[in-house]
């Protein structure tokens, strides 16, 4: 039998990915990070 039509069983949560670079002073260089949903993860 063919399968009936259904969407994927896996939910997709859309979140904003924000890359940022922050200057923390000439002696320390810069921090590059990745923010996912408001949390810095890298």
């Amino acid at each position: 039998d063919a399968e009936f039509r259904h969407d994927s069983g896996y939910e997709v949560h859309h979140q904003k990915l924000v890359f940022f670079a922050e200057d923390v002073g000439s002696n320390k260089g810069a921090i590059i990070g990745l923010m996912v949903g408001g949390v810095v993860i890298a």
């Epitope: 039998d1 063919a2 009936f4 039509r5 259904h6 969407d7 069983g9 896996y10």
Partner: antibody, heavy 121, light 112 residues
């Protein structure tokens, strides 16, 4: 609120073509993921799924009846239609129009009141 | 076709008792997307069927928590923990994974 209402001829003779209309409100068949279908029930017996049509005009049929069934829609008028050719006494039943989506409403959450067909010579 | 076999076909119960209805599918009704489209509907005399449970164990909006669904693969159960008079009617299991979509023959719940 969501409502569905079936209409049909009531009585047909064997070999005639059945034309059913489902008029609905409270949702749109232009909405991605939405679908409307037909289920029938002979008096005092169980339920049999017939066909389903999706917002993008994709159609599914019961293979045992596919050669006799045609489902179609008019999204702008909020209507779905079912035609069954060459009816026989075995097609005597109550015909229900049902809503089912592919996403959040992926179940038969709303049913019409049903329209009764009698096939008799 | 996927055959849905319900037992018992008739279920006499007393008010306040627990009722249990079994539904077995002739083969797995796990869809390729990972979901199991097993549903339960109740049809009261003179009315259209109404949805109780979807995807095996999820109660539909407004359905009392006395109703619970369980199972997996090919073996499913509907339980009513404390039967009330308004629970009388015919209960149908249904699979929505494979074409044709198919219903069980129904279980008539009636009060003793």
């Amino acid at each position: 609120q969501v409502t569905l209402k079936e209409s049909g001829p009531g009585i047909l003779k064997p070999s005639q073509t059945l034309s059913l209309t489902c008029s609905f409100s409270g949702f749109s068949l232009s909405t991605s993921g939405m679908g409307v279908g037909w289920i029938r029930q002979p008096s005092g017996k169980g339920l049999e799924w017939l066909a389903h049509i999706w917002w993008d005009d994709d159609k599914y049929y019961n293979p045992s009846l596919k050669s006799r069934l045609t489902i179609s829609k008019d999204s702008s008028r909020n209507q779905v239609f079912l035609k069954i050719t060459s009816v026989d006494t075995a097609d005597t039943a109550t015909y229900y129009c049902v809503r089912r989506g592919t996403r959040l409403e992926d179940y038969f959450d709303f049913w019409g009141q049903g329209t009764t067909l009698t096939v008799s010579s | 076709d996927v055959l849905m076999t319900q037992t018992p076909l008739s279920l006499p119960v007393s008010l306040g008792d627990q009722a249990s209805i079994s539904c077995r599918s002739s083969r797995s009704i796990v869809h390729s997307n990972g979901n199991t489209y097993l549903e339960w509907y109740l049809q009261k005399p003179g009315q259209s069927p109404k949805l109780l449970i979807f995807k095996v164990s999820n109660r539909f909006s407004g359905v009392p928590d006395r109703f619970s669904g369980s199972g997996s693969g090919t073996d499913f159960t509907l339980k009513i923990s404390r039967v009330e008079a308004e629970d009388q009617g015919v209960y149908y299991c249904f699979q929505g994974s494979h074409v044709p979509l198919t219903f069980g023959a129904g279980t008539k719940l009636e009060l003793k």
